[in-house]
């Protein structure tokens, strides 16, 4: 058995349903995406040995599903998947990878072929600990590369300052596949949000630990860099589920006046 979870139940139906639903969010010029053709292109990877799937095996899938990402709307992340999805609000606020078509269809799913058979493996799938060229990691590598290449304007990045190993994973999708593929001539600046979990530890903030490494890397690449601790709009969203926690107390005079009234 592999170390990862097996192929998601009803993979094809979920994929096609998400694709059809997403089309309505696309611009009039791009909404005629052929979901069946996109699925068939994706399925190429499901016909290969589960440790022999390369990022390039998803090239046709990406070419068929790719669409424009509005300027200033890109939102990269590490260790904050659910918070990013909630904050992006189905492309309304931002368009992270999970909110572009080729990311949406696979978000939170798993897939692979059986090792010595043609069927899908619903029991387990390989992770990077099993083998590097597994279907899921190769998919997100290829999708991340494309997402970076198509991003423009202000680049936003949400990192988790409560993560025990540090806010910026030196080895991760953002570091290894996204930063190297940012198109410098299309980008005005990079804005990092270091979020801390409500009531959670403050492991790192802007300018500390791994964040210094990230800042140096981006500045060395010639990017204009800024960093915000606990970006308020995201913090307010976090506080929805922790309204009585001291971290969520409204500190403004206007709020105090409202409470008295």
């Amino acid at each position: 058995r592999w170390r990862g979870e097996g192929t998601s139940a009803h993979l094809r139906d979920i994929f096609l349903g998400r694709c059809a639903e997403y089309r309505a969010l696309l611009s009039p010029e791009q909404r005629n995406k052929n979901c069946t053709a996109i699925w068939e292109a994706f399925k190429v990877a499901l016909d290969k040995d589960p440790c022999s799937v390369l990022p390039s095996d998803y090239d046709l899938f990406i070419n068929l599903s790719r669409h424009s990402i509005p300027r200033d709307k890109s939102l990269f992340w590490e260790n904050s998947h659910l918070l990013v999805n909630s904050f992006a609000d189905n492309t309304r606020r931002f368009m992270p990878l999970s909110d572009v078509l080729y990311g949406r269809v696979a978000d939170f799913l798993s897939w692979c072929r059986q090792k010595n058979d043609s069927g899908l493996d619903y029991q387990s799938c390989p992770t990077s600990e099993d083998c590097e060229n597994n279907p899921v990691d190769s998919f997100w590598k290829r999708a991340s590369i494309q997402y970076s290449k198509d991003s423009s304007g202000v680049i936003h990045v949400m990192l988790n300052g409560s993560e025990p190993t540090g806010a910026y994973p030196i080895k991760g999708f953002f570091a290894d596949y996204e930063i190297p593929n940012l198109q410098k001539e299309k980008i005005t600046r990079i804005e990092i949000w270091v979020m801390h979990e409500i009531g959670g530890p403050n492991v790192e903030s802007c300018g500390e630990g791994s964040m210094k490494v990230l800042e140096k890397r981006l500045k060395d690449m010639g990017f204009q860099y800024s960093c915000i601790n606990d970006y308020r709009p995201v913090k307010l969203l976090q506080c929805v589920d922790h309204s009585t926690h001291p971290d969520c107390a409204l500190k403004s005079a206007a709020a105090a006046t409202q409470r008295k009234a």
Epitope: S27, P28, E29, Q30, R71
Partner: antibody, heavy 115, light 107 residues
Framework: QVQLQQSRAELVMPGASVKMSCKTS????????VHWVRQRPGQGLEWIGA????????DYSQKFKGRATLTVDESSSTVYMQLSSLTSEDSAVYYC????????WGQGTTLTVSS | DIQLTQSPASLSASVGETVTITCRAS??????LAWYQQKQGKSPQLLVY???TLGEGVPSRFSGSGSGTQFSLKINSLQPEDFGSYYC?????????FGSGTKLEIK
């Protein structure tokens, strides 16, 4: 307010090429596609092609593929259309319009192809 | 490419009458159809999009209906300013295409 200002009328010889412009203002240029549509005298509207403002995507009608070329200059929020190998059949008014719904149109550029 | 067949090619009507123009798509375009009005020597103007949503400032006497492959534009109580040409156009992804047009003339 949204405006699309097109270049002035052109008179060109058969076989030549022409490049017309469409300068946009009043909206975020990179967020929308710009379409080109032509209308020959006494005829209907004919879609030529479109390009997105960030210059990532474009598409052309099968009829104009290889002969029409759309380009953008993001710094001036201007879209250009070059049409090559012109014949008298290309004499028409050429409109640019902002996508995705073609709600805003330029005033049109009249092209006359004649020797 | 998706073909749009518009009919009639022309029609004559009087002020106050109701007219209907139809547009048939060669394949399913769901509700992604728009209608434009064009006056002589002027740029086209968006009347209706998504089959039945009226464009900015378009009078309520205009209405669109249909879905899939069959669509129509209805003009109630024709006004003098309504005379001109009308075109359907799909916005279900590029390449966009237009119908051949309907010329509406005063009887």
């Amino acid at each position: 307010q949204v405006q699309l200002q097109q270049s002035r009328a052109e008179l060109v010889m058969p076989g030549a090429s022409v490049k017309m412009s469409c300068k946009t203002s009043g909206y975020t240029f990179s967020d929308y596609w710009v379409h080109w549509v032509r209308q020959r005298p006494g005829q209907g509207l004919e879609w030529i092609g479109a390009i997105d403002g960030s210059d990532t995507f474009n598409d052309y009608s099968q009829k104009f593929k290889g002969r029409a070329t759309l380009t953008v200059d993001e710094s001036s929020s201007t879209v250009y259309m070059q049409l090559s190998s012109l014949t008298s059949e290309d004499s028409a008014v050429y409109y640019c319009a902002r996508g995705g719904l073609l709600q805003y149109w330029g005033q049109g550029t009249t092209l006359t192809v004649s020797s | 490419d998706i073909q749009l067949t518009q009919s009639p090619a022309s029609l004559s009507a009087s002020v106050g009458e109701t007219v209907t123009i139809t547009c048939r798509a060669s394949e399913n375009i769901y509700s992604y159809l728009a209608w434009y009005q064009q006056k002589q020597g002027k740029s086209p103007q968006l009347l209706v999009y998504n089959t039945k949503t009226l464009g900015e400032g378009v009078p309520s006497r205009f209405s669109g209906s249909g879905s899939g492959t069959q669509f129509s534009l209805k003009i109630n109580s024709l006004q003098p300013e309504d005379f001109g040409s009308y075109y359907c156009q799909h916005h279900y992804g590029t390449p966009f295409t237009f119908g051949s047009g309907t010329k509406l003339e005063i009887k």
